[in-house]
Amino acid sequence: MMTGTIETTGNISAKKGGSVILQCHLSSTMAQVTQVNWEQHDHSLLAIRNAELGWHIYPAFKDRVAPGPGLGLTLQSLTMNDTGEYFCTYHTYPDGTYRGRIFLEVLESSVAEHSARFQIP
């Protein structure tokens, strides 16, 4: 039985040209995390972090995605096209797969505040 829950940074905003941390956290389970996949709203892959084999970063993002912190991703040099949904998929043993959602809004405003809070979707 899957007892865990995914906590995410929820709905976040950041300014164009800046950077943002996409972070998910799996809690309430003793399952072993074998891999975390990060995908964008159109289901294209940003990155994979395998527990033993490390990081794979999709070529389109190699210049502006930094692995981490932890199992998260830092997305840099934000553009308006980065606005949208991001999904973290946790592959675990023995539980199976958990999925979390983050919505990122990239703002033109130079005074846009980076607002983030952990929430259970």
Partner: antibody, heavy 119, light 107 residues
């Protein structure tokens, strides 16, 4: 340039073990994973597993977990795969491969070692 | 395990023709797919990855596309030297798996 050097062939008896080598050159050995792929004669490709040379961590295809052991020797920039309790099903070409920069795709391949299991 | 199915084991084509090889994943693999070429007696070579990026030095007649579960590898104008077996491979989740291969034969 990046090179992965493997011995051409190994002849081993059923029940025995064999340790295949893959000597890497032309890049920083600990910066890229080494993967192993099996190809039986006239057949397709099968991923065995991979090793992270910086820390020795391994990830296996479950089908090979009790068959293969993956290790590295950082001092000689060499990856090893030991195959145990060999049977005729293990007769195949074994390739070592290296990933791309921050990529899991197999960008560089050794020439492969043909393992023949025969009494 | 994710099964990668290449529906054609053999494809016959002529020099100058356009040919497409398809690969279907048994479950979602996003864009974590690569294509390899293996000529007789040689090691495989990476041609396309992720799944539309041409690897360094690969001629531009080779292209790839797709996402999710359906992927296509295309040679826009087949050359005699393209005689080979072509494999798709997913690295979305371990164990990473290959398709069974498609052997391209030149008429």
């Amino acid at each position: 340039q990046v090179q992965l050097q493997q011995p051409g062939a190994e002849l081993v008896k059923p029940g025995a073990s064999v340790k295949l080598s893959c000597k890497a050159s032309g890049y920083t050995f600990i910066s890229y994973n080494i993967y192993w792929v099996k190809q039986r004669p006239g057949q397709g490709l099968e991923w065995i597993g991979g090793v992270n040379p910086s820390n020795g961590n391994t990830n296996f295809n479950e089908n090979f977990k009790s068959k293969a052991t993956l290790t590295v020797d950082k001092s000689s920039s060499t990856a090893y795969m030991q195959l145990s309790s060999l049977t005729s099903d293990d007769s195949a070409v074994y390739f070592c491969t290296r990933g791309n920069y921050y990529g899991y795709e197999f960008a560089y391949w050794g020439q492969g070692t043909l393992v023949t299991v025969s009494a | 395990d994710i099964v990668m199915t290449q529906s054609h084991k053999f494809m016959s084509t002529s020099v100058g023709d356009r040919v497409s090889i398809t690969c279907k994943a048994s479950q979602h693999v996003s864009t974590a797919v690569a294509w390899y070429q293996q000529k007789p007696g040689q090691s495989p070579k990476l041609l396309i990855y992720s799944p539309s990026y041409r690897y360094t030095g690969v001629p531009d007649r080779f292209t790839g596309s797709g996402s999710g579960t359906d992927f296509t590898f295309t040679i826009s104008s087949v050359q005699a030297e393209d005689l080979a077996v072509y494999y798709c491979q997913q690295h979305y989740s371990t164990p990473w798996t290959f398709g069974g291969g498609t052997k391209l034969e030149i008429k």
